[in-house]
Every structure is written in structure tokens, then in C-alpha cells.
């Protein structure tokens, strides 16, 4: 009566670059099975209620199940197994022919890694700082990796950037973006995105720090030529980017077509899906070839607005032209004209 | 903080019918699913039904067709109603929850009840 359910159950999530997505494999007494998604009657395209895996997703320290389903590139390790009886179960399965096995995908999301360092460097004086400088995102309290306010750390010299609207600092930007490994800079944060304002349940030790940095060359490759120390401002705004390495991404799936890759597009806002809206900013492919990619599916064949004559359609919109550029969604109440995307599928 | 609390159980002949409860309370925007388990006395705890968020159930072997698992998304409550009950039943049932924080980005971690304790006699 094994069952994915059990506490001692183990499964890994193979061939992505993430612990939290890839091919399920689970171990067995013999050792590590991948999975089949013909497993327990289904058929291999079948995409299933992603929260019956939850367990799994809790056991490998990740978040919620987004999706659970054929994982379109198969690589087929030495042993495959095709599972019977309830969704999840593992207490009859037998061996797959390879070939005849497409593997089961799980994609569960990977929670931002935001949390500072338990303790900061304590402010000083003196001596002058000897270690490497650093620098850190601080999002705030569930906020997304990538996303925050900028801290640099000299030696134990550490605190927030002064920064004035007027500044012209876009290289500097892509520079600190990249050496944070969160790609190239999309945009400054308000305060209140960034998360400046102290959280009444944040522990004593990440308060704003003592010292605070100015910018000092915009144009610095390396980073202890980017700032000077300042007296710290007791108002005024301290810089907080939004690097394009953002995590959650916006999730997208195609509803309502005859098969995974065609639908009606859906994003996840949260744990609801909803209707992403048309619009105008995003009338060329390029935003539907990325919802083809996610889905792991070929380009795009074609896309059509649905026409939004109820005045009561809602959904969501995104303002970029590409979704992985959008880091927030916003509610369309009315008039939400919806987008039907027909993606090549690769196993027609 | 997340609390979970069960409540129903007690003692009920062969052949009768129980109804537990459990309610999730705190911050529990994002439950993923929420389970029931049992436990034996000498024996390891077992999962005995399984709810989601998107309504899939999943029934252990020895329960389908006599238990019933369901729930009132509102209350973030989850009732286990159990029929045709047998002395083999006779356990402590734990509610469990799997529940991300951080408005559904966080980690996905498991809360567990107290237990509530059911006795079926010959």
C-alpha cells in the first residue's frame, strides 16, 4: 500500500536545472524508477489536479504544486515503471518498455530565497573594512527573489544606497543586477514594493542598518569603485531594483483547445488561475511563443482575440509584452478580452 | 501561526457511523490539500483519505467505499464521514495540512492536529 502519501516516501525531480521541476522518480525497494504518465489509467498527455502531489513538493522543500503531467522531453534512464490503481499509489506498478514510457513531470514552486543572513555585520568604525564587498537583495517578507532593495557591505561596513530619481544610472544597474546573478535590470522599485517599511514580525537583526552609500561612479565595473559612505538620510529614497532573474515567474496554461498545446491562456496569480487579458502592448508573438515554451510545447501556429462583449469578463493583465517581464498582474474587471494560442504540438 | 484541530472522534459499535472534523485556522490562505491519517497502537501511521485544492480525494485500499472525505472551503475545514465501521478502524485520527505562507509563495510545510481518538467495538 505504498503511496506517495507515506511518510517516508522518496522522490526526486530529475533533468532541470531546479530540485522543484523536472521528471519524477521515485525510489522503490529495487531503487530509482522514473515514472510513466500512462501510469494509473491515464493517457500520456493528461495533465491532472497538481495538488495531489503536494506531499511531494513538501518533501523536497519547495512550494505549492503548479503543475502535474507529461514532461515533454523524456530521457529515459535504465528503469521506468507504469504504476496502478489510484493516482500517487506505487503499490503495483511493473516495468515499461523505454520506449513506450513518456515521463511524468512535476513542477512545484520554487519559493524565493530572500531570507538576509541572520546576522548582519555589525556596525564599526574601525578597522577599514578588509573583506570582499558584497551586495544583497532584500525583499521584503515574501516578496520575490531578485526583486528589493539594494544593500552593499564593505568588510563589516553594510547598509542601503541613497538614491535620487534623477540619477542616470542604467549601466550601473545591469552591472549590480549581474553581479547579484539576477540577470540585466528591468526597473526601480517604489519603497513599497521593495519592502523599505519594517515588518512589526521581522526579527531585531534585519532593521535598516547604521551606514548608509551613495553612488559615486554609475559607471564602476567593479564594485568597490560604486559607492561612497554617507551620514545616513533620514528620508529620501534608497534604491531598490527589479533585476529580469525575478522569481515566481507568471505561470501560463492553455484551457479549452483539444490538447495541452492550444487553449484559451490562463496565468496563476497566487493559487487561482485566471483569464490573461488582451493587450495592446503585446500584439506581436513574441508573448505567445514564450506561453508555447512553458508549456513545452512547438511555436506558434496562430493566436485570436475572443471578442469581450460581456461587460462582466474578467481576468488578468499584464502590461509588458512579454509575460516573463511582467513581475506584477493586475485585475481587469470588465471587458477582458481573451487569447486563443494554437502551439505546434510535438507529439501530434 | 497555523493551528489545526480535530474533533468527532469516540466510541461507536461495529457497523456504525462517525463524522470527524478538522479546521485549519491562522494563515491559511494557501492550503494545498489537507489529509486524514491514522494510527494504530504497535502499528505505523497510515494516510487514510486526501483532499486538494482542486477537489481530487484519494482513498487508502482498505477505506474506499466506506469513508468519504469532503470539505467547506469557507471554514478551511475538512470532515472524514466514516460508514460500515470495523474493530479494525479502531485508531488515533490526525488531521494534516499541507500549507505555503507568504500568499501561496512560500514553502509548502505540514501541520499536524492533536489527534481525536476512535474506538469501534465488536
Known amino acids: 500500500r505504498l503511496s506517495w502519501y507515506d511518510p517516508d516516501f522518496q522522490a526526486r525531480l530529475t533533468r532541470s536545472n531546479s530540485k522543484c521541476q523536472g521528471q519524477l522518480e521515485v525510489y522503490l525497494k529495487d531503487g530509482w524508477h522514473m515514472v510513466c504518465s500512462q501510469s494509473w489509467g491515464r493517457s500520456s498527455k493528461q495533465w491532472e489536479d497538481p495538488s495531489q502531489a503536494s506531499k511531494v513538493c513538501q518533501r523536497l522543500n519547495c512550494g505549492v504544486p503548479l503543475s502535474l503531467g507529461p514532461f515533454l522531453v523524456t530521457y529515459t534512464p535504465q528503469s521506468s515503471i507504469i504504476c496502478y490503481g489510484q493516482l500517487g499509489s506505487f503499490s503495483n506498478c511493473s516495468h515499461s518498455r523505454n520506449d513506450m514510457c513518456h515521463s511524468l513531470g512535476l513542477t512545484c514552486l520554487e519559493p524565493q530565497k530572500t531570507t538576509p543572513p541572520t546576522t548582519r555585520p555589525p556596525p564599526t568604525t574601525t578597522p577599514e573594512p578588509t573583506a570582499p564587498p558584497r551586495l544583497q537583495l532584500v525583499a521584503q517578507s515574501g516578496g520575490q527573489h531578485c526583486a528589493g532593495v539594494v544593500e552593499f557591505y564593505s568588510g563589516s561596513l553594510g547598509g542601503t544606497i541613497s538614491y535620487e530619481a534623477q540619477d542616470k544610472t542604467q549601466d550601473l544597474e545591469n552591472f549590480l543586477c549581474n553581479n547579484l546573478q539576477c540577470g540585466s535590470f528591468l526597473k526601480h522599485l517604489p519603497e513599497t514594493e521593495a519592502g523599505r517599511a519594517q515588518d512589526p514580525g521581522e526579527p531585531r537583526e534585519h532593521q535598516p542598518l547604521p551606514i548608509q552609500w551613495k553612488i559615486q561612479n554609475s559607471s564602476c565595473t567593479s564594485l568597490e569603485h560604486c559607492f561612497r559612505k554617507i551620514k545616513p538620510q533620514k528620508s529620501g529614497r534608497v534604491l531598490a531594483l527589479l533585476c529580469s532573474g525575478f522569481q515566481p515567474k507568471v505561470q501560463s496554461r492553455l484551457v479549452g483547445g483539444s490538447s495541452i498545446c492550444e487553449g484559451t491562456v490562463e496565468v496563476r496569480q497566487g493559487a487561482q488561475w485566471a483569464a490573461l487579458c488582451d493587450s495592446s502592448s503585446a500584439r506581436s508573438s513574441l508573448r505567445w511563443e514564450e506561453v508555447c515554451r512553458e508549456q513545452q510545447c512547438g511555436s506558434v501556429n496562430s493566436y485570436r482575440v475572443l471578442d469581450a462583449g460581456d461587460p462582466t469578463s474578467r481576468g488578468l493583465f499584464c502590461p509588458h509584452q512579454k509575460l516573463s517581464q511582467c513581475h506584477e498582474l493586475w485585475e481587469r474587471n470588465s471587458y477582458c478580452k481573451k487569447v486563443f494560442v494554437t502551439c505546434q504540438d510535438p507529439n501530434p | 501561526e497555523v493551528q489545526v484541530v480535530e474533533s468527532g472522534g469516540g466510541l461507536v459499535q461495529a457497523g456504525g457511523s462517525l463524522r470527524l472534523s478538522c479546521a485549519a485556522s491562522?494563515?491559511?490562505?494557501?492550503?494545498?490539500?489537507m489529509y486524514w491519517y491514522r494510527q494504530a497502537p504497535g502499528k505505523a501511521r497510515e494516510m487514510v483519505a486526501a483532499?486538494?485544492?482542486?477537489?481530487?480525494?484519494y482513498y487508502e485500499d482498505s477505506v474506499m467505499g466506506r469513508f468519504t472525505i469532503f470539505r467547506e472551503n469557507a471554514k478551511n475545514t475538512v470532515y472524514l464521514q466514516m460508514n460500515s465501521l470495523k474493530p479494525e478502524d479502531t485508531a488515533v485520527y490526525y488531521c494534516?495540512?499541507?500549507?505555503?505562507?507568504?500568499?501561496?509563495?512560500?514553502?509548502?510545510?505540514?501541520?499536524w492536529g492533536q489527534g481525536t481518538q476512535v474506538t469501534v467495538s465488536a
Open positions: 483532499i486538494t485544492s482542486g477537489g481530487s480525494t
Open positions: 491562522g494563515d491559511t490562505i494557501c492550503i494545498s490539500a
Open positions: 494534516n495540512a499541507d500549507i505555503a505562507g507568504h500568499n501561496c509563495s512560500g514553502y509548502l510545510k505540514e501541520y
